[in-house]
Interface confidence: low
């Protein structure tokens, strides 16, 4: 017994005074604890614990299961122990078959011996299979066999404790090692959709998938900048031994505008954390926003093509689209398609293809679109540029020469006098009167201009040219006249197109 100075409490003394005691099965175990402040005996083996308040522990007929550590404790909390082996050739091992090991840690195969004098205390694989080459273990007859640094590859390994007794190998009951994987990476998290757009009252449901090596991964849905507890449902699966998947589904059964915001799926394990977010936007009602992809005022030359293109955002999805001109709906020549195939897409494109436009086809082209909540429209004003066309050219009864031309943009009419038979008319003549005839109407069709000059100003034979022109082209008409004595002869008008 350890020596102590007088007055200082000392641990109890045990008889027999040795650390280990070996008895045969059926023999008596008699242990005496001597201490003025005796409190109790405690017996421990595997998960079993027994107590005895008598200072003498007597087991009349020892059994293998009486093998274990006997501890005597006094009132000062000081204790002394003796380990008793009850040798039973028919029961060499005490076993607790539950065997769990954490990856990279040591784990104990709990198969303490009832006889410390057997040899070759070790582990063996089941059915004669060899143990993994890298498996290291340390035997301890009182505790079992410690497997060092458990590997993930040992999961579901079947093994026995083994000893040699009288030259023969004796095996314990079998153990199945269950390895709890260590987290060596952060969880993998993903979300069903990155953004959601809903109307008030609709259900919001989003699923986060968490993948890790075991179910011990922690996950939760959180609202950013909020501590409100969220209602979520879980489903989980083990796809093989170290491939765990959990689906955490967050649901708001009737979303409100103030539910809008960013929701985070957060997961962590002992290695670290990961998160993924989804954005919810709740609107009080649906909407449509139209964006013209070209100017809404369009100028196009006669005979050319033009595409009227709009992009629009529509939520909920558009139900009716149409292009209209002069109160008529186009049944073809247009197409409407989503901007993207993404499930969250709310942006669409509509194109009206106008081909070989005539001067008479200028005007307002309107795109209309509607969904279950709203209607929207956008108008394009299309102007068709046409070269001037001379509608009339005449000598009026009052002696005036009149020329009327139509085109877009508005034509300009110039007058020229050509003396004699010359074809080049260079001397310009100022008109007496110029009028735009239809300026009060909508400015989509051709504009008609009328110009007049006084023929009495001409004193010589010759030709008068009326030239109408705009940005697109020009057209001319001619008046031929001659003097006979003092009288002018009949004027003969004719036209000449000048490209």
């Amino acid at each position: 017994q350890p020596s102590v100075s007088p007055g200082e409490p000392s641990p109890p003394s045990i008889h027999p005074g040795k650390s280990d005691l070996i008895v045969r099965v059926g023999d008596e175990i008699r242990l005496l604890c001597t201490d003025p402040g005796f409190v109790k005996w405690t017996f421990e083996i595997l998960d079993e614990t027994n107590e005895n308040k008598q200072n003498e522990w007597i087991t009349e007929k020892a059994e293998a299961t009486n093998t274990g550590k006997y501890t005597c404790t006094n009132k000062h909390g000081l204790s002394n122990s003796i380990y008793v082996f009850v040798r039973d050739p028919a029961k060499l091992f005490l076993v607790d078959r539950s065997l769990y090991g954490k990856e990279d840690n040591d784990t104990l195969v709990r198969c303490p011996l009832t006889d410390p004098e057997v040899t070759n205390y070790s582990l063996k694989g089941c059915q004669g299979k060899p143990l993994p080459k890298d498996l290291r273990f340390i035997p301890d007859p009182k505790a079992g066999i410690m497997i060092k640094s458990v590997k993930r590859a040992y999961h579901r390994l079947c093994l026995h404790c083994s000893v040699d007794q009288e030259g023969k190998s004796v095996l314990s009951e079998k153990f199945i090692l269950k390895v709890r994987p260590a987290f060596k990476a952060v969880p993998v998290v993903s979300v069903s959709k990155a953004s959601y757009l809903l109307r008030e009252g609709e259900e919001f449901t989003v699923t986060c998938t968490i993948k890790d090596v075991s179910s011990s991964v922690y996950s939760t849905w959180k609202r950013e900048n909020s501590q409100t507890k969220l209602q979520e449902k879980y489903n989980s699966w083990h796809h093989g031994d170290f491939n765990y998947e959990r689906q955490a589904t967050l649901t708001i059964s009737s979303a409100r505008v103030n539910d809008s915001g960013v929701f985070m799926c957060y997961a962590n394990n002992t290695f670290g954390s990961a998160n993924v977010t989804t954005t919810l936007e709740v609107v009080d009602k649906g909407f449509i926003n139209i964006f013209p992809m070209i100017n809404t005022t369009v100028f196009v030359n006669d005979g050319e093509n033009v595409d009227l293109i709009v992009e629009y955002e529509a939520f909920p999805k558009p139900e009716h689209q149409q292009w209209i001109y002069m109160n008529r709906t186009f049944t073809d020549k247009w197409e409407d398609y989503p901007k993207s195939e993404n499930e969250s897409n709310i942006r669409y494109v509509s194109e009206l293809h106008l081909t070989r436009l005539k001067g008479t086809e200028g005007g307002t082209y309107t795109f209309l679109v509607s969904n279950s909540d709203v209607n929207a429209a956008i108008a394009f004003n299309v102007y068709v540029n046409t070269k001037p066309e001379i509608l009339t050219y005449d000598r009026l009864v009052n002696g005036m020469l009149q020329c009327v031309a139509a085109g877009f943009p508005e034509p300009t009419i110039d007058w020229y006098f050509c003396p004699g038979t010359e074809q080049r008319c260079s001397a310009s003549v100022l008109p007496v009167d110029v009028q735009t005839l239809n300026s009060s109407g909508p400015p989509f069709g051709k504009l008609v201009v009328q110009s007049s000059i006084d023929s009495s100003a001409f004193k010589h034979n010759g030709t008068v040219e009326c030239k109408a022109y705009n940005d697109v082209g020009k057209t001319s008409a001619y008046f031929n006249f001659a003097f006979k004595g003092n009288n002018k002869e009949q004027i003969h008008p004719h036209t000449l197109f000048t490209p």
Partner: nanobody
Framework: EVQLLESGGGLVQPGGSLRLSCAAS????????MSWVRQAPGKGPEWVSG????????YYADSVKGRFTISRDNSKNTLYLQMNSLRAEDTAVYYC??????????????WGRGTLVTVSS
């Protein structure tokens, strides 16, 4: 070594209440999701309720929703199940389990030895 020790079971009349406790040791309790699982006589195990490591998330089987409340005290390493409005069909052995598996065949990593709850008049 992980240990889970349930207590608080007993005989109670229909409509009555019980509070189960589960004392945990041998692991970092505050790091793990915990569950209650029950097994009625002659039936297979049934997952009852689960709680996240920080107690922020709780979830329940439809059969107990609104009647049972799961909670935990990480400072005491203890898991609780408050059972109200008990019915005869709640009679079972109640196990405390580590992990959040929804179906028993997935197996929990560790579980206790159970405490018996009997609901009978």
């Amino acid at each position: 070594e992980v240990q889970l020790l349930e207590s608080g079971g007993g005989l109670v009349q229909p409509g009555g209440s019980l509070r189960l406790s589960c004392a945990a040791s041998g692991f970092t309790f505050s790091a793990y999701t915990m569950s209650w699982v029950r097994q009625a006589p002659g039936k297979g195990p049934e997952w009852v309720s689960g709680i996240g490591p920080d107690g922020f998330i709780t979830y329940y089987a439809d059969s107990v929703k609104g009647r049972f409340t799961i909670s935990r005290d990480n400072s005491k390493n203890t898991l609780y199940l408050q059972m109200n409005s008990l019915r005869a069909e709640d009679t079972a052995v109640y196990y405390c389990a580590q992990g959040d598996s929804r179906s028993w065949h997935n197996s929990f990593d560790y579980w206790g030895r159970g405490t018996l709850v009997t609901v009978s008049s």
